[in-house]
Interface confidence: low
């Protein structure tokens, strides 16, 4: 499995954005496919759960993420993004996409860094 | 606006340390992670590492693990890249930028030479 | 790591003429990030996310690809686009950088 994210992103606080992961493998797309997102805060706090997929999507039923994040995938166009709803400034970090479609090997995991800014191009 | 001030040259001797600056202003400081880049003409550019202004996080590339240590001062919103055991394969242009979605910020670079 | 190869290393057009520059990947990447540089002046980035031109950047560029290879095209050649391009990788760790292709006005 090949993980595709973009290295970066930014978003201004409060809005909503897509964490952007595709993928690519040699195996179909099956019900064997799972997709596991997990953020690093970036003042180095213990790794948290974000979404989970399988058949079905699994949200945060506690934490940080709790009704903020939904899935925005389709997994028979190897798309794995989700969305993240009403971002706050703690939501800065790193964001990690995981896919496992067996019997491919598993790929590198992606990782998108996000800072969220008062107003996008640093006109803070 | 954004600016990554750097000096503009260095010249050490072979086999000492030397540390490079770089002050950030205009921008949240803790908000971007910050890179290194070593220029050599007619090599390209090589990618360092990077570090986490917010906890001091680093993230070196393998072939400069032992070369390279990147630090911080929030205070003086400053990074720091020293380079140990100096040779001349270390003469270079090294930039500190930081990396947004759409638009990379760059220092000017300090230009290092290594010569007795 | 990925090796990013460009082509041509060196090339001249004339004003008008349409340009193309390429970088190829050593394995399979999400997408290319490519730099303006002068002499002097610290790169410049270009295009971002593979086909994303950055702030004021004219609309006569574009970039396109996928997989292994990806390409920087000038739709018609202008006097201020002569300098060195470089593309980058950002799918794996560490990111690497092309060799460079230095764009020569004819």
């Known amino acids: 499995v090949e993980i595709y994210t973009s290295r970066v992103l930014e978003a201004v606080n409060g809005t909503d954005v897509r964490l952007k992961c595709t993928f690519s493998s040699f195996a179909p797309v099956g019900d064997a496919l799972t997709v596991t997102w997990n953020f690093r805060p970036l003042d180095g706090g213990p790794e948290q759960f974000v979404f989970y997929y399988h058949i079905d999507p699994f949200r945060p039923m506690s934490g940080r993420f709790k009704d903020r994040v939904v899935w925005d995938g389709n997994p028979e166009r190897y798309d794995a993004s989700i969305l993240l709803w009403k971002l706050q400034f703690d939501d800065n970090g790193t964001y990690t996409c995981q896919v496992k479609n067996p019997p491919d090997v598993d790929g590198v995991i992606g990782e998108i860094r996000l800072s969220v800014v008062h107003t996008v191009r640093f006109s803070e | 606006q954004v600016q990554l001030q750097q000096p503009g040259a260095e010249l050490v001797k072979p086999g000492a340390s030397v540390k490079l600056s770089c002050k950030a202003s205009g921008y949240t400081f803790t908000n971007y992670w910050m890179h290194w880049v070593k220029l050599r003409p007619g090599q390209g550019f090589e990618w360092i590492g990077e570090i986490n202004p917010t906890n001091g996080g680093t993230d070196y590339n393998e072939k400069f693990k032992r070369k390279a240590t990147l630090t911080v001062d929030k205070s003086s919103s400053t990074a720091y890249m020293q380079l140990s055991s100096l040779t001349s394969e270390d003469s270079a242009v090294y930039y500190c930028?930081?990396?947004?979605?759409?638009?990379?910020?760059w220092g000017q670079g300090t230009t290092l030479t290594v010569s007795s | 790591q990925i090796v990013l190869t460009q082509s041509p290393a060196l090339m001249s057009a004339s004003p008008g003429e349409r340009v193309t520059l390429t970088c190829s990947a050593s394995s399979s990447v999400g997408y290319m990030y490519w730099y303006q540089q002068k002499p002097g002046s610290s790169p410049k980035p270009w295009i971002y996310?593979?086909?994303n031109l950055a702030s004021g950047v004219p609309a006569r560029f574009s970039g396109s690809g996928s997989g292994t290879s990806y390409s920087l095209t000038i739709s018609s050649m202008e006097a201020e686009d002569a300098a060195t391009y470089y593309c980058q990788q950002w799918s794996s760790n560490p990111p690497t950088f092309g060799a460079g292709t230095k764009l020569e006005l004819k």
């Open positions: 996310v593979t086909s």
């Open positions: 930028t930081i990396y947004t979605t759409a638009l990379d910020y």
